[in-house]
């Protein structure tokens, strides 16, 4: 997991490489400015959306090379003993709220699975990532609104749950969890884009995705 420093770094999508490049450009231009991640993500997403297949090519090549690197490194990687042991999770603890992207996936996954029954879970996720990535900020708004509402509810629920006191096994992880909460939330804005948004394999000639008509 995240604990093993020897574990190969996860492979990056073309969109993640693009965001990284944007971030580097931004840092060069404004070295002292702090980044508003949601604004930055929105700008990146809009810019990616209007890029041509040729412009995206550079990032797709980077992603292909990184995928090859990851696969090569994973072949020789041996996970440490006890890696699979899961830390105690209280079944009564409030569930973490879904992200806007996750809510979006719940809407469109049935269609993609229904029309492409042979697709692997990974390929369905990739298609959903492409779709989200090609969705304008205005169109994402209802999902983001709902995700924010659920996050707000979760924060209230988790506060109440913590106030009540937890089972001893869970208590140990709480201090650490509290400390890392702020850092985690800052990182999440970036991870949402990088982990959840896959690249768009744009073709020169568009095809119809829908093949469901009876």
């Amino acid at each position: 997991g995240k604990g093993d420093p020897k574990k190969p770094r996860g492979k990056m999508s073309s969109y993640a490489f693009f965001v990284q490049t944007c971030r580097e450009e931004h840092k060069k231009k404004h070295p002292d400015a702090s980044v508003n991640f949601s604004e930055f993500s929105k700008k990146c997403s809009e810019r990616w959306k209007t890029m041509s297949a040729k412009e995206k090519g550079k990032f797709e090549d980077m992603a292909k090379a990184d995928k090859a690197r990851y696969e090569r490194e994973m072949k020789t990687y041996i996970p440490p003993k006890g890696e699979t042991k899961k830390k105690f999770k209280d079944p009564n603890a409030p569930k973490r709220p879904p992200s806007a992207f996750f809510l979006f996936c719940s809407e469109y996954r049935p269609k993609i699975k229904g029309e492409h029954p042979g697709l692997s879970i990974g390929d369905v996720a990739k298609k959903l990532g492409e779709m989200w990535n090609n969705t304008a900020a205005d169109d994402k708004q209802p999902y983001e609104k709902k995700a924010a509402k659920l996050k707000e509810k979760y924060e209230k629920d988790i506060a109440a749950y913590r106030a009540k006191g937890k089972p001893d096994a869970a208590k140990k992880g709480v201090v650490k969890a509290e400390k890392s909460k702020k850092k985690k939330e800052e990182e999440e804005d970036e991870e949402d884009e990088e982990d959840e948004e896959e690249e768009e394999d744009e073709e020169d000639e568009e095809e119809e995705e829908d093949d469901d008509d009876e």
């Epitope: 809407e107 229904g114 029309e115 900020a137 744009e202 568009e206 095809e207 995705e209 008509d213």
Partner: antibody, heavy 122, light 107 residues
Framework: EVQLLESGGGLVQPGGSLRLSCAAS????????MHWVRQAPGKGLEWVSR????????WYADSVKGRFTISRDNSKNTLYLQMNSLRAEDTAVYYC???????????????WGQGTLVTVSS | DIQMTQSPSSLSASVGDRVTITCRAS??????LNWYQQKPGTAPKVLIY???SLQSGVPSRFSGSGSGTDFTLTISSLQPEDFSTYYC?????????FGQGTKLEIK
């Protein structure tokens, strides 16, 4: 054959209400975004509203926000538009249409229903 | 909102003519642009989606091009059934917006 059939239009007084229905057939209704588009007599097309496949998420044109409500019943393959506080400027033919996506996730409207006329007049 | 401006608003042409209708977006929309044809008293019908892809069943005399802010619909050789009104529409964001339409009439 993919078909959309609107109903529920008619003459209504300003401030009144009307509920439009759109019956879908020939495709898996629950997979698709659905939209309402209207056309005032002798004028161009105006997008009105959109609803996500499950019905959980909705979008509206500013001109109808707070007055119109889009909904769907996937078990009945039917799309609805509840129109309240109607104004003279809402007079139009209302079309329901399906949002289709290309492999690059570009959306377009296909097919369209035949439309239902809503007249708001005293 | 993204404004879509079509030109010309109306156009007179003859059977066999080559006709071009243009559509301009108020901001860059990539290739998120569709073209529809509407005959009097009937619902619109999609001709071109994603700026240049021909909808199945639409004659090949219709073609679309452009990206960013400027788009064109071309009819290479007008047929009698092509005299109708044409609309462009952006699907880049919400609200979806249409051009005001171009009425194609017989000269």
């Amino acid at each position: 054959e993919v078909q959309l059939l609107e109903s529920g239009g008619g003459l209504v007084q300003p401030g009144g209400s009307l509920r439009l229905s759109c019956a879908a057939s020939g495709f898996t209704f629950s997979y698709y975004d659905m939209h309402w588009v209207r056309q005032a007599p002798g004028k161009g097309l105006e997008w009105v509203s959109r609803i996500s496949p499950s019905g959980g998420y909705t979008w509206y044109a500013d001109s109808v926000k707070g007055r119109f409500t889009i909904s769907r019943d996937n078990s009945k393959n039917t799309l609805y538009l509840q129109m309240n506080s109607l104004r003279a400027e809402d007079t139009a033919v209302y079309y329901c249409t399906r949002g289709r996506y290309t492999s690059g996730w570009h959306e377009y409207f296909d097919p369209w229903g035949q439309g239902t006329l809503v007249t708001v007049s005293s | 909102d993204i404004q879509m401006t079509q030109s010309p608003s109306s156009l007179s042409a003859s059977v066999g003519d080559r006709v071009t209708i243009t559509c301009r977006a108020s901001q860059s929309i990539g290739t998120y642009l569709n073209w529809y044809q509407q005959k009097p008293g009937t619902a619109p019908k999609v001709l071109i989606y994603a700026a240049s892809s021909l909808q199945s069943g639409v004659p090949s005399r219709f073609s679309g091009s452009g990206s960013g802010t400027d788009f064109t619909l071309t009819i290479s050789s007008l047929q009698p059934e092509d005299f109708s009104t044409y609309y462009c529409q952006q699907s880049y964001n919400t609200p979806r917006t249409f051009g005001q339409g171009t009425k194609l009439e017989i000269k």
